[in-house]
């Protein structure tokens, strides 16, 4: 089947890399500088990715494969293949129309993106706080409050918030 | 009880994708995060990320980024963790996980889902 | 990334003795560390969170200490059910991160 479509299409012997040319009669050419086939069979190259701006280029584009970006210090990558750069803000906070705020009361934002979340409720679970929540911090739940000695307490300050925290990935 | 069951082990040809199920019972699905840990063979635990199932919100290990897309489904308690472009070096036993009660600890593990990436 | 840098990676140690092993991040994590037991059935379990807190139905002889960058984790008395592969394991920050392991053998 493979010899049988190689007759009857010269194109489909086009390695990754190049294209087939149809100005040079279906001679396999080369990608040309900025661009790239990545699959076998191609009729054109495709222009490679730039990382400008905001963006950064962690991979170079090559003959094969596009080129791939992330954000530059201070931003974080949001959409598939990091298709847009939204801004970091800082542990306990959360990003909206009017930029960076604080966390509400008994929520928290333990990373340099996402929004400020609910506090976990430790007694969905039967188990009590172990560990306060803060700005910064989910509370730690710990044992059912049936589960502790007599006389301990079970509630322990939460521990200081330090960057970098939960890094943003 | 607590429970994550997940799927069986897949073998799979170089450049092949997998997709990894794990369901969940006996508790709020929505409301506790779902971890997935690898472990190559002899090898230790490395964490791949992790999904919020109320919002799907996700995390992903850098390494795994290219790797792994993890996502999961309310309606049926059930999370899960795609893997594409398998080599060899993908050979391993994936085990998804859900947390204590806040994301820091990861209390209980599913049985483990072998993959096995081989021509 | 934080590194875990877990040790012994296997012991040998008689039903009785006092077990100990060691964990050290690369960096402050607080006290967000948490150990684990891997039974040679691959079935891993959380024995203890947050340092030192014990995981609701774990014998008491497993304890764990610590904070900061230096923690440990003790068994008082080995049992024969106790052979299996121990991971340390940090919370504080994305990615978690593992220790490579501790093999723990009954001479």
């Known amino acids: 089947f493979e010899r049988t479509r190689s007759l009857q299409d010269p194109c489909s012997n086009c390695p990754a890399g190049t294209f087939c040319d149809n100005n040079r009669n279906q001679i396999c050419s080369p990608c040309p500088p900025n661009s790239f086939s990545s699959a076998g069979g191609q009729r054109t190259c495709d222009i490679c990715r730039q990382c400008k701006g905001v963006f950064r280029t962690r991979k170079e584009c090559s003959s094969t494969s596009n080129a791939e970006c992330d954000c530059t210090p201070g931003f974080h990558c949001l959409g598939a293949g990091c298709s847009m750069c939204e801004q970091d803000c800082k542990q306990g906070q959360e990003l909206t129309k009017k930029g960076c705020k604080d966390c509400c009361f008994g929520t928290f934002n333990d990373q340099k993106r996402g929004i400020c979340r609910p506090w976990t409720n430790c007694s969905l679970d039967g188990k009590s706080v172990l560990v306060n929540g803060t700005k910064e911090r989910d509370v730690v739940c710990g044992p059912s409050p049936a589960d502790l000695s007599p006389g301990a307490s079970s509630v322990t300050p939460p521990a200081p918030a330090r960057e970098p925290g939960h890094s943003p990935q | 009880q607590v429970q994550l069951v997940q799927s069986g082990a897949e073998v799979k040809k170089p450049g092949a994708s997998v997709k990894v199920s794990c369901k969940a019972s006996g508790y709020t699905f929505t409301s506790y995060w779902i971890n997935w840990v690898r472990q190559a063979p002899g090898q230790g635990l490395e964490w791949a990320g992790n999904i919020y199932p109320s919002d799907s919100y996700t995390n992903y290990n850098q390494k795994f980024k290219d790797k792994a897309t993890i996502t999961a489904d309310k309606s049926t308690s059930t999370a899960y963790m795609e893997l594409s472009s398998l080599r060899s070096e993908d050979t391993a036993v994936y085990y998804c996980?859900?947390?204590?009660?806040?994301?820091?600890?990861?209390?209980?593990w599913g049985q483990g889902t072998t993959v096995t990436v081989s021509s | 990334d934080i590194q875990m840098t877990q040790s012994p990676s296997s012991l040998s140690a008689s039903v009785g003795d006092r077990v100990t092993i060691t964990c050290r991040p690369s960096?402050?994590?607080?006290?967000?560390l948490n150990w684990y037991q891997q039974k040679p059935d691959k079935t891993v379990k959380l024995l203890i969170y947050?340092?030192?807190r014990l995981r609701s139905g774990v014998p008491s002889r497993f304890s764990g200490s610590g904070s900061g960058t230096d923690f440990t984790f003790t068994i008082s008395s080995l049992q024969p059910e106790d052979i299996a592969t121990y991971f340390c394991?940090?919370?504080?920050?994305?990615?978690?991160?593992f220790g490579q392991g501790t093999k723990l053998e009954i001479k």
């Open positions: 394991q940090q919370g504080d920050t994305l990615p978690y991160t």
């Open positions: 960096q402050d994590i607080s006290n967000y």
């Open positions: 996980t859900r947390d204590y009660g806040s994301a820091y600890s990861m209390s209980t």
């Open positions: 947050y340092t030192s």
